[in-house]
């Protein structure tokens, strides 16, 4: 399986909220002995490779922000901890999962990574990640709403 990032760049005004998204692309093994662990973290372009460094998002580690479930289930973090930091990660039945960040500040700018671990019991873990950039802007040059740039091209879309 692979992880797709529909958008590689999100440009948002300060104070806005943004939802960063990743999509799990098949084939996905939905057997009894396969489980998925999904999470989010901040990173850099990489000492070893992009997303190999794991930094907290608003002081919450990848452990705090994880989603867990088998291949068929939807999941959501409704932890008070995440909510208190203006964060919420969620996953649907169709392989899409996201993290929503409210009340953006300039400090939220940076590289974000989604990580999917396919746990094949008796075999190994298979890790796949996706990376995307968030730029939070302030002042007269900032957009009125988040503008997203698709990964495949530089055409932008405005999210209202």
């Amino acid at each position: 399986f692979k992880v797709a990032t529909p958008y590689s760049l999100y440009v948002c005004p300060e104070g806005q909220q943004v939802t960063l998204t990743c999509r799990l692309l098949g084939p996905v093994d939905k057997g009894h002995d396969v489980t998925f662990y999904k999470t989010w973290y901040r990173s850099s372009r990489g000492e070893v490779q992009t997303c190999s460094e794991r930094r907290p998002i608003r002081q919450l580690t990848f452990q705090d922000l994880h989603l867990h479930h088998g291949g068929h289930q939807a999941a959501q973090t409704s932890h008070d901890l995440a909510q208190r930091h203006g964060l919420e990660s969620a996953s649907d039945h169709h392989g899409q999962f996201s993290i929503t960040m409210r009340n953006l500040t300039l400090l939220d700018s940076g590289l974000y990574c989604c990580l999917v671990v396919e746990i094949r019991h008796h075999h190994s873990e298979h890790r796949v990640h996706g990376a995307m950039e968030l730029q939070v802007q302030t002042g007269k040059d900032a957009p009125s709403n988040c503008v997203v740039y698709p990964s495949s091209s530089q055409d932008s879309e405005q999210i209202t």
Epitope: R54, G70, I119, E125
Partner: antibody
Framework: QVQLQESGPGLVKPSETLSLTCTVS????????WSWIRQPPGKGLEWIGY???????NYNPSLKSRVTISVDTSKSQFSLKLSSVTAADTAVYYC???????????WGQGTMVIVSS | EIVLTQSPATLSLSPGERATLSCRAS??????LAWYQQKPGQAPRLLIY???NRATGIPARFSGSGSGTDFTLTISSLEPEDFAVYYC?????????FGGGTKVEIK
Amino acid sequence: QVQLQESGPGLVKPSETLSLTCTVSGGSISSYYWSWIRQPPGKGLEWIGYIYYSGSTNYNPSLKSRVTISVDTSKSQFSLKLSSVTAADTAVYYCARDIPASAFDIWGQGTMVIVSS
Amino acid sequence: EIVLTQSPATLSLSPGERATLSCRASQSVSYYLAWYQQKPGQAPRLLIYDAFNRATGIPARFSGSGSGTDFTLTISSLEPEDFAVYYCQQRINWPLTFGGGTKVEIK
């Protein structure tokens, strides 16, 4: 703050079954691997196996024929059974939480088990 | 099974000195390697995961590097509480295995 506590007999006779329980407090037993690791006196660490919160297990091939790990989510406990023990199974037994794609981040304090008649 | 070989077996240093510990894998483990510290009578404590990510609450004097088969744990300036045994552990596949350990002792 998640804490782990091992419990069980400290002395087991050869050929009998070693049984230990690990109680998880201060957090959920969901979404992690729950492992057993042992350390013979003066030696290094050996991973015995894990149970995932979903009930799936994975054992070290060197011990697989003798090991059973089970979980009771209602009690936030997981257990180790090691059959047909010999003196070579004398060790400190640790339970630990293992995070997917990470490492053993929380350990119990360990319990010494001596195999002797 | 992946075999991890740690060297040296014992490292004799003084407080304030730099400690460099090595871990070599029998085959590539990518960067899926962790380091632990163990003091006498205590459980191991996670220091580093994925070769260079410090675990929560670990001081900046501990750093990890490497990928593939060769890894290093560096303690930039030894504090009295750092004298202990250090283990590396791989998680690229099961069974999970540990190195034999390096004892860092006071010179």
